[in-house]
Interface confidence: low
């Protein structure tokens, strides 16, 4: 597993990757497993009541690089981690939701302390 900012050596990605899915399962998934030519992901975000919700599933290869990059956006309390190294690899991903940050530490609208590790395996 690599920390943010570290480069990752390319790994052989199976042409069809199986991923655990939760809240993001396509209709043809069986036993909460989906298939993709791209990445498995696990994501945590806040619902409108402030409750953290974890979802997981498959991302297609097209566009998934951008989605997995997880650029920090103030206020959008969301964190996503992606993997490709083996089937169902996303069951071992545990992204954490960044909280609001003290204004002392930032300029502009606020406010995330990023304490999650970004597991992005190409």
């Amino acid at each position: 597993k690599k920390e943010d900012g570290e480069s990752t050596a390319p790994t052989a990605r199976p042409k069809v990757l199986r991923c655990k899915c939760h809240h993001h399962c396509p209709e043809d998934s069986v036993n909460n497993i989906c298939s993709t030519d791209g990445y498995c992901f696990t994501m945590i975000e806040e619902d409108d009541s402030g409750t953290p919700v974890v979802t997981s599933g498959c991302l297609g290869l097209e566009g998934s690089d951008f989605q997995c990059r997880d650029t920090p956006i103030p206020h959008q309390r969301r964190s996503i981690e992606c993997c490709t190294e083996r089937n169902e690899c996303n069951k071992d991903l545990h992204p954490t939701l960044p909280p609001l940050k003290d204004r002392d530490f930032v300029d502009g609208p606020i406010h995330h302390k990023h304490h999650h590790h970004h597991h992005h395996h190409h």
Epitope: I44, E46, D48, S49, G50, P52, I73, P74, H75, Q76, R77, P95, T96, L97, P99, L100, K101, D102, R103, P109, I110, H111, K113, H115
Partner: antibody, heavy 116, light 113 residues
Framework: QVTLKESGPGILQPSQTLSLTCSFS??????????VGWIRQPSGKGLEWLAH???????SYNPALKSRLTISKDTSNNQVFLKIASVVTADTATYYC????????WGQGTLVTVSA | DIVMSQSPSSLAVSVGEKVTMSCKSS????????????LAWYQQKPGQSPKLLIY???TRESGVPDRFTGSGSGTDFTLTISSVKAEDLAVYYC?????????FGAGTKLELK
């Protein structure tokens, strides 16, 4: 069902340290994103946010009181603590704990009186 | 710090009347990336804890009667009670959760005429 309950000493003297406990159920401070805050309200007056603690032990304090405040947690026992050092009579208030940063769940409050 | 100003400080009303109260912030609470206003409204009855009524400036908390409506954006916000009931007599506070320190308005007290 989320419930929070504050407890404190009731009465203490100026210059002492106030220790408050927030005991809660129906939420866990080990859940990513979860936080608990402390708010106080002097009798007949408005609400003042004091401090906040998150699941990952991040902390935020009201700058006006920061030097006197310490917030901490005991995740396994579902408790959050607030200490206020060197209390003065102006610290007399009802102290509330609440979930999150928009406070959907509040405790019933505990009245603290600072009196010589 | 973001300063929250509420007006009026008190309001004498009759049951059935429509009521509006104002909350202004010293800086915008609208975040352009998600077009959300980081403002909440609370109701506090005598001897009770505050109760969340509205968040995101206009979203009613579950179980809150639809006579309560939040509106506004940026720095100017309004709480409207379409037809006041006796049980609505309370103090109403606005709060910003756009940045720390979290701050509250001084409150608007709703009283019977």
């Amino acid at each position: 069902q989320v419930t929070l309950k504050e407890s404190g000493p009731g009465i203490l003297q100026p210059s002492q340290t106030l220790s408050l406990t927030c005991s809660f159920s129906g939420l866990s401070l080990s859940t990513p994103g979860m936080s608990v805050g402390w708010i106080r309200q002097p009798s007949g007056k408005g609400l003042e946010w004091l401090a906040h603690i998150w699941w990952n032990d991040d902390k935020s304090y009201n700058p006006a009181l920061k030097s006197r405040l310490t917030i901490s947690k005991d995740t396994s026992n579902n408790q959050v603590f607030l200490k206020i050092a060197s209390v003065v009579t102006a610290d007399t208030a009802t102290y509330y704990c609440a979930r999150g940063d928009r406070f959907a769940y509040w405790g019933q409050g505990t009245l603290v009186t600072v009196s010589a | 710090d973001i300063v929250m100003s509420q007006s009026p400080s008190s309001l004498a009303v009759s049951v059935g009347e429509k009521v509006t109260m104002s909350c202004k912030s010293s800086q915008s609470l609208l975040y352009s990336n998600n077009q959300k206003n980081y403002l909440a409204w609370y109701q506090q009855k005598p001897g009770q804890s505050p109760k969340l009524l509205i968040y995101w400036a206009s979203t009613r908390e579950s179980g809150v009667p639809d006579r309560f409506t939040g509106s506004g954006s940026g720095t100017d916000f309004t709480l409207t009670i379409s037809s006041v009931k006796a049980e609505d007599l309370a103090v109403y506070y606005c709060q910003q959760y756009y940045s720390f320190p979290l701050t509250f308005g001084a409150g608007t007290k709703l009283e019977l005429k």
